[in-house]
Amino acid sequence: APVRSLNCTLRDSQQKSLVMSGPYELKALHLQGQDMEQQVVFSMSFVQGEESNDKIPVALGLKEKNLYLSCVLKDDKPTLQLESVDPKNYPKKKMEKRFVFNKIEINNKLEFESAQFPNWYISTSQAENMPVFLGGTKGGQDITDFTMQFVSS
């Protein structure tokens, strides 16, 4: 059976939107009006992995692009990147672990924990126009809470 996917955008708890920053990075900033068209649309695929009521494994691809968020070690540190894939083979139900995030819902907010690196989360900074990154702390000054907005296909 084909993998189930939905299109969505994400905003952090400060209402910053996510946009492309160069070819292989995302950044977070406040957008208004026409500029909202800049925000990236994700194709969120529901993939194989450990699942519970509030924790669902997903892969986050960029809609109509062969790019997926992935978590890899760089200089011995878990790092978030956008990785190119062969569009003939992706998305798939059994995604490599580096592409998998545990989507965790808490109080109507979403967290995205790396499956490859437990307790590391997709994060943004308080500051405007700065990269989205993989952070190893929750509840500090970096933001790990997001809301999801559905986008029609």
Epitope: S21, K27, S123, S125, N129, M130, F133, G135, Q141, D142
Partner: antibody
């Protein structure tokens, strides 16, 4: 008054190491991104590295990647740049700068000169 | 990486002149552009951020315009203290990059 004071520069042989420090005062250091920017003698400005307030997010120029490490100690209001495997082309005045809105450098230190020569 | 090209690289002008410096980005950087002034032996000083916003304490004779790929810094009525080197810098994406600089000399 915002003040940034770099130290740790000097003469070092190729292949050697140095650690630069930048002491910050006059603002809440722990809330700001910080940059290192360098300027070779008689040349233009080159961005070197950035670190987020928490220290969790860092980025580097390709020219220093794998050799330089940016870090900070928020309890000491101090920014660092560990420079290893230094080359002649790393010779420059190194500035630390506070990051303002959207990624500009709104306050700069006076700079510290690093000379790599045998 | 985004390349920033400044022109002219140097210019001679007189006190009271109106001067325009151009900065071009190799790709769209929206309005994420800053301008700096540097005098010999000193650190750069932020003049303009977000392409058009005057930094606090900077005289109103400095102004910035542009968005996308083409930007200008204008100095209305040059003053003696304005003879310096000016740099643009894009903040759209890492690695951040600077223009090569424009040296403004006294004619």
């Amino acid at each position: 008054e915002v003040q940034l004071l770099e130290s740790g520069g000097g003469l070092v042989q190729p292949g050697g190491s140095l650690r630069l420090s930048c002491a910050a005062s006059g603002f809440t250091f722990s809330k700001y991104f910080m940059f290192w920017v360098r300027q070779a003698p008689g040349k233009g400005l080159e961005w070197v590295s950035v670190i987020s307030p928490s220290g969790q997010m860092t980025r580097y120029a390709d020219s220093v990647k794998g050799r330089f490490t940016i870090s900070r100690d928020n309890s000491k209001n101090t920014l660092y740049l560990q420079m290893n495997s230094l080359r002649a082309e790393d010779t420059a005045v190194y500035y630390c700068a506070r990051v303002g809105y959207g990624g500009n450098s709104d306050y700069w230190g006076q700079g510290t000169l690093v000379t790599v020569s045998s | 990486d985004i390349q920033m090209t400044q022109s002219p690289s140097s210019v001679s002008a007189s006190v009271g002149d109106r001067l325009t410096i151009i900065c071009r980005a190799s790709q769209d950087i929206n309005r994420w552009l800053a301008w700096y002034q540097q005098t010999p032996g000193n650190a750069p000083k932020l003049l303009i951020h977000s392409a058009t916003s005057l930094q606090s304490g900077v005289p109103s004779r400095f102004s910035g315009s542009g968005s996308g790929t083409d930007f200008t810094l204008t100095i209305n009525s040059l003053q003696p203290e304005d003879f310096a080197t000016y740099y643009c810098q894009q903040a759209d994406s890492f690695p951040l990059t600077f223009g090569g600089g424009t040296k403004v000399e006294i004619k």
